[in-house]
């Protein structure tokens, strides 16, 4: 069952709901965090809970079984079904933006490739709700700084269209 905190605008699909493999991660984040890094998975998008659960499993399988990571790299994944999928969550250090930024940021990744199109309005609302939720829960500072993945590493992520979009979000700061 999706859990919805009263302060959150969008429900978060817990790991057991999307049948995640057990995490082997141990490094904790020091909350509240000052940074959020937005990326895209650059793979397939999904627009139903069933297909997004499968996509979250695919990403996690690649990260754990191919790359040898302790879990899916992202703290949260965003589906075009308008739902947020719990990755490492608020408390564990991700593997999304390199060694410099991982320990001091939350990594949220939109499932899909956003070089040539923007995510659905539902996905955008879900991400914005998650960020509001993070502030309300004390996981993010109220003056947190939002960055695109390409602002912190040499990459095309989060894709041209999504990158242009997040540059208009209130907490975005350029490199």
């Amino acid at each position: 069952q999706e859990t919805e905190d009263p302060a959150c605008c969008s429900p978060i699909v817990p790991r057991n709901e999307w049948k995640a493999l057990a995490s082997e991660c141990a490094q904790h984040l020091s909350l509240p965090l000052r940074y959020v890094v937005v990326s895209h998975t650059a793979g397939s998008s999904c627009n139903t809970p069933a297909s997004c659960q499968q996509q979250a499993r695919n990403v996690q399988h690649y990260h754990m079984k191919t790359l040898g990571w302790c879990d899916v790299g992202y703290n949260f994944l965003i589906g075009e079904d308008g739902l947020v999928y719990e990755g490492r969550g608020w408390n564990f250090t991700g593997a999304h933006s390199g060694h410099l930024w991982n320990p001091m940021s939350i990594g949220i990744s939109f499932m899909g490739n956003y070089m040539d199109r923007v995510p659905t309005p539902q996905a955008i609302r879900a991400a914005q709700g998650l960020l509001a939720c993070g502030v309300a829960q004390g996981a993010l500072r109220s003056n947190y700084v939002l960055k695109g993945h390409r602002d912190v590493q040499r990459t095309l992520s989060p894709g041209n269209q999504l990158y242009h979009l997040i540059q208009n979000w209130p907490h975005y700061r350029s490199p």
């Epitope: 490094q27 250090t93 390199g98 060694h99 410099l100 590493q153 040499r154």
Partner: antibody, heavy 119, light 106 residues
Framework: EVQLQQSGAEFVKPGASVKLSCTAS????????IHWVNQRPEQGLEWIGR????????KYDPNFQGKATITSDTSSNTAYVQLSSLTSEDTAVYYC????????????WGQGTLVSVSA | QIVLTQSPAIMSASPGEKVTITCSVS?????MNWYQQKLGSSPKLWIY???KLAPGVPARFSGSGSGTSYSLTISSMETEDAASYFC?????????FGAGTKLELK
């Protein structure tokens, strides 16, 4: 919080060897490269070499090949550099630093260890 | 080995003054990193991948350049910016640093 904690100062005689340690907290060294860099008194920075603790792969600057040996122990999240046949020219502060496997910059640095070589 | 030549070696600037430190490269590289070091402390990553600011670095700092010429600029010098700055390149295990620029407060 990410930290690289280095061992204390070493005062040694010419010809001796010394082994310096660098213990990481806040991250797993297996997910990074650990580098060693030195800084002679009033001088610039020189890269010595690095280790990939996930597989013990090492690379060295040619100037330090034979002088430095870098190792790691993932169970204690610690990297080491052993410096051999020390001379006064090796007197310097030695820093460990960490980098992502896919990035080309040193994200975090230890506080440094002074090695002083004198008869 | 790729040689990085920094200039000037030492400079002083007044608060509010614009400061530019340059790093010339003996053969073309794709990006440059910069570290700040204060007396008695270890270096800190300051600017990486030519123009990206490390977390917590004030926005008055910027980095630019390409090929064989790179620079670090402070738009308006502040007291806390007095330090040594080192450029650094890493290309296929030719990792080298510049000799450093000592920036003093005038």
């Amino acid at each position: 919080e990410v930290q690289l904690q280095q061992s204390g100062a070493e005062f040694v005689k010419p010809g001796a060897s010394v082994k310096l340690s660098c213990t990481a907290s806040g991250f797993n060294i297996k997910d990074t490269y650990i580098h060693w860099v030195n800084q002679r008194p009033e001088q610039g920075l020189e890269w010595i070499g690095r280790i990939d603790p996930a597989n013990d792969d090492t690379k060295y600057d040619p100037n330090f090949q034979g002088k430095a040996t870098i190792t790691s122990d993932t169970s204690s999240n610690t990297a080491y550099v052993q410096l051999s046949s020390l001379t006064s020219e090796d007197t310097a502060v030695y820093y460990c630093a960490s980098s992502d496997n896919s990035d080309s910059w040193f994200a975090y640095w230890g506080q440094g260890t002074l090695v002083s070589v004198s008869a | 080995q790729i040689v990085l030549t920094q200039s000037p070696a030492i400079m002083s600037a007044s608060p509010g003054e614009k400061v530019t430190i340059t790093c010339s490269v003996s053969s073309s590289v794709n990006f440059m990193n910069w570290y700040q070091q204060k007396l008695g402390s270890s270096p800190k990553l300051w600017i990486y991948d030519t123009s990206k600011l490390a977390p917590g670095v004030p926005a008055r700092f910027s980095g630019s350049g390409s090929g064989t010429s790179y620079s670090l600029t402070i738009s308006s010098m502040e007291t806390e910016d007095a330090a040594s700055y080192f450029c650094h390149q890493w290309s296929s295990y030719s990792l080298t640093f510049g000799a450093g620029t000592k920036l003093e407060l005038k």
